[in-house]
Structure formats: C-alpha cells, structure tokens
Amino acid sequence: AVNGTSQFTCFYNSRANISCVWSQDGALQDTSCQVHAWPDRRRWNQTCELLPVSQASWACNLILGAPDSQKLTTVDIVTLRVLCREGVRWRVMAIQDFKPFENLRLMAPISLQVVHVETHRCNISWEISQASHYFERHLEFEARTLSPGHTWEEAPLLTLKQKQEWICLETLTPDTQYEFQVRVKPLQGEFTTWSPWSQPLAFRTKPAALGKDT
C-alpha cells in the first residue's frame, strides 16, 4: 500500500470547511485512513474519516463550524496529515502545512434565476454561497451556455473579471431551449482553483413575433 503513487490535496471553502482528497495507486480499498487537522493558533483539532470515492481515491470534509462562520483567516496555518492504520498503529502517509487562503475552492454558485428573457437575449442572476467577507469584490466568474446539439465541453467560456452576479446572454436563437452554468474563483491564493459548476439553469427564449424580429 505504501509504494503506489500518492497524492493529497485539500481546499478551504473560505468559511468553515476544508475538503480533502487522498489518492494512492495500489492501496487496498478497505484501508482505514483519516485526515487530522492541527491549527497553529486555534484551540481545536479536527479529524475526518477518508471514505472511498473511486478505486484508488478517498475524500473527507473537515467541518470546522456553522456553514457561514469564519473559522480561519489569512494568517492561520493548519497542519494536515493523512494517517492510515497499519496493524495496531497509525502511519503518517502525507503531511502539509496548509495555508487556507492559498488553497481556496468556493462552493458552487446557487439560486440561479432568469431575471428577464426575450427572443435573442436572457438576463440571469445568481448568488455566491458561504464565501468569506474577506474577498470584498475580489472574485471572478466563468459562465457557459449549453446550446441544442452541443455538449458542455464545447460551450465557449464567458469570463467575468469582477464580482458581477448577473449576465446578459445575447445573440440567442428564438424559441430555443438552453442551459446555463456559472462558477466562481477568488483572485487570492497560489493554489486556488475554480468552484464546481453550479447546477444548470434551464430556460427558453421567446418565440419571434410573427412578421417582425424583436
């Protein structure tokens, strides 16, 4: 179990959750492993049990408090260890000094809704979830629209380089079904990555009026 290639990656959602993934080629599926969190300036220690998510990877969430509580700051350091049981003892398999605001991955945007729809355009809004007030306006978004006959992977990415929780989609086809997704990323952090994509929002453009184009 020790000799396979291993990887340990964790992200902070900016509020009260650190999510970790541990992968190791050749590890037994029933190996018992956990993540232990030891902060440098907090009174708590936290542990979560790594549960299998695929053949060679395990995941768990360190829940630090209420979802919207600000449990860590930019000066915190949390030492994270992967511990796996070997017989009667626990062995350290991976270790890192984790700087939460260098390793951000926010929750997917929520509450997507159509504000206004016409024949060729649609205005959509959304909200960010469990995002720290520390960011102020230092966030960016990516959005994509699924057109009929295409896949999400083919959809061009629209980049919003500021904290703008709405978009006006243009040059749409009348009377056509579309789907829309958005994701968010803070500008801060060397290892920060995009949030998951939001749940898709389905909408339909209005049919063109007979005899004229609106």
Epitope: V2, N3, D40, V92, A94, Q96, D97, K99, E190, F191
Partner: nanobody, 126 residues
Framework: QVQLVESGGGSVQPGGSLRLSCAAS????????MSWVRQAPGKGLEWVAS????????DYADSVKGRFTISRDNAEDTLYLQMNSLKPEDTAVYYC???????????????????RGQGTQVTVSS
Amino acid sequence: QVQLVESGGGSVQPGGSLRLSCAASGFTFSNYAMSWVRQAPGKGLEWVASITGFGRGTDYADSVKGRFTISRDNAEDTLYLQMNSLKPEDTAVYYCAKYSSSTYYPPTPARGRDYRGQGTQVTVSS
C-alpha cells in the same frame, strides 16, 4: 525562475559540526515543502530530511536521526541543515531540494521534488 543556492559545506573531523544553508528565490518559499538530499562518492542520491512549509512537520532518514536538524526561516527564504556528531559516512555533496507542492509523503520522501540546487561538499575525515 526557481533558484536554490547551498552554502556552508567544508571539511570537518569526525564528531564535528556544520550548518548548511540554502537560499531560495523565484517562488513563494513558505508555500512549499523542502528537503535535503545527499550524494556520496560513487553512490546514488540519498534523502536526508524533509520539512513542511512552516516547519511544523519534519522527517529524517534513520541514518541521521538525532544528529541532524532541518529548519527554515521563511522571512529570509532560507533552509538550514544543522549537522552534529558528523561521521565519515556523512561525506557527500549535499543538495537542497524543493517539493512541487506544500505536501510531502513520508513513506516515499524522494517523490515529488521538482528542483534542487548545485550542492555543497561536506567532507568528514580525520
């Protein structure tokens, strides 16, 4: 670009001490785990010690445990190796090495290094 420059090597008698330094530049030093490795004449690279980004976790090869201490000064972007009770078998070129992330893996400490310096020679003999 990433640069690692070792210094502090030299000749010393058995039982003596040396302190190696490694000046790092070209990356955010505190965001990365670091290590020392060495290469004795005619031998392959041997892992010596590793340290997490803020020094809260350290690991040592059995051959140096209790004699060597790895540490770092993130304000100065410098990695250190304090070597005490030196033995002839510690003779080697010592390299400072950067891991590719903030994580290192104690069971396979040689894995995941992406840069190392030019090295500094340590000779232990009477």
